[in-house]
């Protein structure tokens, strides 16, 4: 058993039917010695008397808010949450596995640049009685500071019969140098509590591996005289690290017909312009990627050919 | 990915082309190592990230773009003191810091070259003959060093009398390639920045 926060405790249980459970001793936070009784949640049934209460915790019915009283007055509370260990693996019932880029990916994180700012998000089908708390650091043995905001509900979507809820959090490394070569990963820890169930999720990554630039901006077409060709031009996104000659991007330019089945023409360039043939009803899209370290491509920025 | 390869203009900063080749070569070698050593801990998540140049060179600090020198987090250890002149500085008014930067890059390359050659000698003794260093990568390191053209003491190749542990050597190869790839990215960024300056 360990303390999650004041008066909130997590009991770690080997979780299988008929498992022996854990014996827990609760102590009433009071100088009083006599006439103390204990109750659980809203029930008035007295579970025991005395300054300490010993309980065998085996299932969720044994968890909840234990209260010690004296003569009708509440002395203190202890909320017991359960953390299930199924066959030696901590349970992951609260969050959905996003399965990208691999199984058991519960947290996904992205950074728009090398400033040390990043966003993480996760999914759940649970809509009520749910709280999250997020901590982060650079490295784990001698952790360096990363400050995270509060997790917020950022999207809701319907998936088949279920509603899916997306939560996200923004974090910022306290003293980040964009040019630094990372040797210690960023660690992100999310505590999730649903009713009386506690779970924790972690992700470990280097900022360089989660870079996903914003799409190129100011995408423009300039028709070339006496030709079906156009000059496409664009700019680095505002959110990208500077100077751009050091933090260079490479670009992919795509000409896509109206029909998804039509052949796509693609050109790769390090410049911020390209000459392409603009077909009728086609659209031109450009996306960006770090020129030197192949992390994710940005989303496409698009303009119609007409 | 199949990006078109840029061919440098004759007047272009002479080292840019070599640094691009270096990054391509080390990335290919790392990919080959990951595939060949699939049952070894060779991915970025599995390895310890060690930098063999730590406390010996300070390329990141010495080569920091001017725009980032205002960022205090980037200025924690700028006390290296290499100074010399190399051919990459040809016909340019170069600052002390630029000379320091290129000299630091040269020292990095020299250290990695020694490590890779020592490791290759061990890998050639492996009866499994599972993986060897790409000669192209070693050649590209050499070419960039020559382009930098710094006068420096030659570091003798390490030789070991004990029987090599091939498992450990292959894991060390992965660690070294990951670190060298990160340094090659920095070198490429620096050369691109200097070329634009």
């Amino acid at each position: 058993i360990w303390e999650l926060k004041k008066d909130v405790y997590v009991v770690e249980l080997d979780w299988y039917p008929d498992a022996p459970g854990e014996m827990v001793v609760l102590t009433c936070d009071t100088p009083e010695e006599d006439g103390i009784t204990w109750t659980l949640d809203q029930s008035s049934e007295v579970l025991g008397s005395g300054k300490t209460l010993t309980i065998q915790v085996k299932e969720f019915g044994d968890a909840g808010q234990y209260t010690c009283h004296k003569g009708g007055e509440v002395l203190s509370h202890s909320l017991l949450l359960l953390h299930k260990k199924e066959d030696g693996i901590w349970s992951t019932d609260i969050l959905k596995d996003q399965k990208e880029p691999k199984n058991k990916t519960f947290l996904r994180c992205e950074a728009k640049n090398y400033s040390g700012r990043f966003t993480c998000w996760w999914l759940t089908t649970i809509s009520t009685d749910l709280t999250f708390s997020v901590k982060s650091s650079r490295g784990s043995s001698d952790p360096q500071g990363v400050t995270c905001g509060a997790a917020t509900l950022s999207a809701e979507r319907v998936r088949g019969d279920n509603k899916e809820y997306e939560y996200s959090v923004e974090c910022q490394e306290d003293s980040a140098c964009p040019a630094a070569e990372e040797s210690l990963p960023i660690e992100v820890m999310v505590d999730a509590v649903h009713k009386l169930k506690y779970e924790n999720y972690t992700s470990s990554f280097f900022i360089r591996d989660i870079i996903k630039p914003d799409p190129p901006k100011n995408l423009q077409l300039k028709p070339l005289k006496n030709s079906r060709q156009v000059e496409v031009s664009w700019e680095y996104p505002d959110t990208w690290s500077t100077p751009h000659s050091y933090f260079s991007l490479t670009f992919c330019v795509q000409v896509q017909g109206k029909s998804k089945r039509e052949k796509k023409d693609r050109v790769f360039t390090d410049k911020t312009s390209a000459t392409v043939i603009c077909r009728k009803n086609a659209s031109i899209s450009v996306r960006a990627q770090d020129r030197y370290y192949s992390s994710s491509w940005s989303e496409w920025a698009s303009v119609p050919c007409s | 990915r199949n990006l078109p390869v840029a061919t440098p203009d004759p007047g272009m900063f002479p080292c840019l082309h070599h640094s691009q080749n270096l990054l391509r070569a080390v990335s290919n070698m790392l990919q080959k190592a990951r595939q060949t050593l699939e049952f070894y801990p060779c991915t970025s998540e599995e390895i310890d990230h060690e930098d063999i140049t730590k406390d010996k060179t300070s390329t990141v600090e010495a080569c920091l773009p001017l725009e980032l020198t205002k960022n205090e987090s980037c200025l924690n250890s700028r006390e290296t003191s290499f100074i010399t002149n190399g051919s990459c500085l040809a016909s340019r008014k170069t600052s002390f810091m630029m000379a320091l930067c290129l000299s630091s890059i040269y020292e990095d390359l020299k250290m990695y070259q020694v490590e890779f050659k020592t490791m290759n000698a061990k890998l050639l003794m492996d009866p499994k003959r599972q993986i060897f260093l790409d000669q192209n990568m070693l050649a590209v390191i050499d070419e960039l060093m020559q382009a930098l053209n710094f006068n420096s003491e030659t570091v003798p190749q390490k030789s070991s009398l004990e029987e090599p542990d091939f498992y450990k050597t292959k894991i060390k190869l992965c660690i070294l390639l990951h670190a060298f790839r990160i340094r090659a990215v920095t070198i490429d960024r620096v050369m691109s920045y200097l070329n634009a300056s």
């Epitope: 299988y16 039917p17 008929d18 030696g88 693996i89 199984n103 | -």
Partner: antibody, heavy 112, light 107 residues
């Protein structure tokens, strides 16, 4: 007493469908993840798929992905395995399990 | 996918013998390994989880050990009811995979 009882097995033609059920009792079913495991005649054990408590996470073996669907109805203390596009190689005894408890198994035969 | 290679595939032993079955994972699986016992025409029985933890009710003569890639199930003194087929399983990553089984027969 903890019990897991499978049902719904039988003979089916290739390409056909079958729905297996597993009735659980003796424990708080909704609080536990469940698995399906199968065993072809004379062969070893093969994991088919798993479902977490609350159905938030469901995983399948590559051999059945896209053809089999695992679901649960906590109000009925029941686990299900919907099997579509059955192949002869799906012939096996199917067990539902929640360590350390296993059902007795139900036999599925896919044959023309 | 992680392969679990069990050895031997079969062995003959006498009552009272100490029996050791090994299982090798193709990749590091930590301690996320379970062992099962199965008798002909019966459902498997769970013995060990987390490489070395016995489920309640499993006799103490069964013990498991190992971590990473090498795991062992030991029966310290073979009893008549222990003649069966034993399977190891990794549950470190999906898909979950079983070893091919070890048949323990009477000598």
């Amino acid at each position: 007493e903890v019990q897991l009882v499978e049902s719904g097995g039988g003979l089916v033609q290739p390409g056909g469908s079958l729905r297996l059920s597993c009735a659980a009792s003796g424990f708080t079913f909704s609080d536990y993840g469940m698995v399906w495991v199968r065993q072809a005649p004379g062969k070893g054990l093969e994991w088919v798929g798993s479902i977490s408590s609350g159905s938030s996470n469901i995983y399948y073996a590559d051999t059945v992905k896209g053809r089999f669907t695992i679901s649960r109805d906590d109000s009925k203390n029941s686990l299900y395995l919907q099997m579509n596009s059955l192949k002869t190689e799906d012939t096996a005894v199917y067990y539902c399990a929640r360590n350390p408890y296993w059902g007795q198994g139900t036999t599925v035969t896919v044959s023309s | 996918d992680i392969q679990m290679t069990q050895s031997p595939s079969s062995l003959s032993a006498s009552v009272g013998d100490r029996v050791t079955i090994t299982c090798k994972a193709s990749q590091n699986v930590g301690t996320n390994v379970a062992w099962y016992q199965q008798k002909p025409e019966k459902a498997p029985k769970s013995l060990i989880y987390s490489a070395s933890h016995r489920y309640s009710g499993v006799p103490s003569r069964f013990s498991g050990s190992g971590s990473g890639t090498d795991f062992t199930l030991t029966i310290s003194s073979l009893q008549p009811e222990d003649f069966a087929t034993y399977y190891c399983q990794q549950y470190n990553s999906y898909p979950l995979t079983f070893g091919g089984g070890t048949k323990v027969e009477i000598k």
